[in-house]
Amino acid sequence: DTYKSEIAHRFKDLGEQYFKGLVLIAFSQHLQQCPYEEHVKLVREVTEFAKTCVADESAENCDKSIHTLFGDKLCAIPSLREHYGDLADCCEKEEPERNECFLQHKNDNPDIPKLKPDPVALCADFQEDEQKFWGKYLYEIARRHPYFYAPELLYYAIIYKDVFSECCQAADKAACLLPKIEHLREKVLTSAAKQRLKCASIQKFGERAFKAWSLARLSQRFPKADFTEISKIVTDLAKVHKECCHGDLLECADDRADLAKYICENQDTISTKLKECCDKPLLEKSHCIAEAKRDELPADLNPLEHDFVEDKEVCKNYKEAKHVFLGTFLYEYSRRHPDYSVSLLLRIAKIYEATLEDCCAKEDPPACYATVFDKFQPLVDEPKNLIKQNCELFEKLGEYGFQNALIVRYTKKVPQVSTPTLVEVARKLGLVGSRCCKRPEEERLSCAEDYLSLVLNRLCVLHEKTPVSEKVTKCCTESLVNRRPCFSALTPDETYKPKEFVEGTFTFHADLCTLPEDEKQIKKQTALVELLKHKPHATEEQLRTVLGNFAAFVQKCCAAPDHEACFAVEGPKFVIEIRGILA
């Protein structure tokens, strides 16, 4: 459909509340350092303008694209160059280059302090102005996560508001709020990581890579739906995510609503698990569909070999309709394997494709591809064995110990990577233990590999900004589906020149005593990385001794009457001790 005014069309489709929320998210994701009030002003101006266009679509500037209108708004900010430096250079470009330029300036690791929830203050803010409270949440999440899936953020903001509606009435606000906020925080961080991977796959590997990923995932989740149905949803979903990743948040939210409507209208042919979802309001409905439980497999599934090995038309299909045929294979294989990770399914499809590419050029293709399914077993065994070993290690060491083992492993593999990045990534990799190792056997593989894909994508995104390791670049860029096996296969870097010992790195202060447990761990793990960068060949025994001595030193000073004085005296002794152990 063509509309005289795109902004009027979106305003009418989305309604004022969602329109304002999405505009606020869009500005917050681009201008991540601007104060909230600045954004509110921009949102108000854009909303007023949209209303004039709704009243008269022929009014001045109403025919302009949303990119043009948003870009003009951003470029009109007087302090743009002062606060954002070369982002202001984008304003010299014309659309669509200007929008592309804005997207390239999104910062995945903005220097914004961590949010610390204060229940009393937050309840006061909530009771004073609910609308502002909702907007502030959107702003704070969007500026920290510039690729967050905008319509999904609107959903989380509703949940956030509900938590406060309930807990601010409670006698003990903190007891009610803190666990709920922490639970929501984990969900939001996972959602941010999932969307970042989707955007990376579209932007770095193309739409086809994203479609293959979605085809496998949806085929697992909706095994009763036929290929045509899944393909239609995949195509629509790719459009939605392309738009959101490209900053077209209004169009993205509008199209996502249309897709949810289509899925619910056709749920009989898609999945038996959508009934509850489809009775919910829009945002909850879309979220619920995205998180829907896997449907049961149809009882009458035929052996895959019939269609993809034994049939004499395999090469005809492969040659004449390559993408469709491989898509059918991926669909059929995925729906039969809800226990496999998406990456594993895509690796299997790649092997199948490579085999046909080779065999269909030969004299006797059926004889050549007859054993293709046997080639899949090693692909399945590799992650299964890796997960088994790592889960055993997790059971033995516990979460913190397992994280430390991963810090050692990854610092040795890629010591050039910055210390904060190594700590962040290894800590997140370590969480795979508590997330997945307790799960039933048939869920472990998909849980672990799909989660590791999210964490390794974070490493790739951070590394791309300041590339320091050829090995990381290679693993990140060669193949999306082989990233995890690529990192797993890396060996300690023997070419690395150890860092000089800097005493300041191992200087600690009294603030360490009052830090929450996780921040205390981060301090210790930072020291561990620095230690390894100085002594990459340190043995496990040496590292264990240093960590034990460190814990004793911190415990001693935090129990002393004057913390700071103790750190000043004991700190230098501890450094000498470290050097002695590692000598």
Partner: nanobody, 126 residues
């Protein structure tokens, strides 16, 4: 989910022609892999010709290549089989089968087609 109804069979002399039709309802025929099979007395169902769903790729058994042509008319939701240069060994009941949601004929195994018409008899005899 898919109902199929064949027509167009009959008695024809060797060397003659016939056009079979298969009208589909309950599903658009262009989204469904559809195929013609035949069954001679005392024999199993054998694949004759097929056409992909949404992808116009056609498939033929070696015994009918160059003589039979499969096609469909999406506006009429109907599948056709144009049979020329008919031979006595083409005598059989002709069935159309559908595998919904399949873009390609990835199998010629009759058991894999969940939907069938009731068949139309073709007799080639002088």
């Amino acid at each position: 989910e898919v109902q199929l109804l064949e027509s167009g069979g009959g008695l024809v002399q060797p060397g003659g022609s016939l056009r079979l039709s298969c009208a589909a309802s309950g599903r658009y025929i262009d989204e469904t892999a559809v195929a013609w099979f035949r069954q001679a007395p005392g024999k199993g169902r054998e694949f004759v010709a097929g056409i992909g769903g949404g992808v116009d790729i056609t498939y033929y058994a070696d015994s009918v290549k160059g003589r039979f042509t499969i096609s469909r008319d999406n506006s009429k939701n109907t599948l056709y089989l144009q049979m020329n240069s008919l031979r006595p060994e083409d005598t059989a009941v002709y069935y159309c089968g559908a595998r919904p949601g399949r873009p390609l004929i990835t199998s010629k195994v009759a058991d894999l087609y969940p939907y069938w018409g009731q068949g139309t008899l073709v007799t080639v005899s002088s």
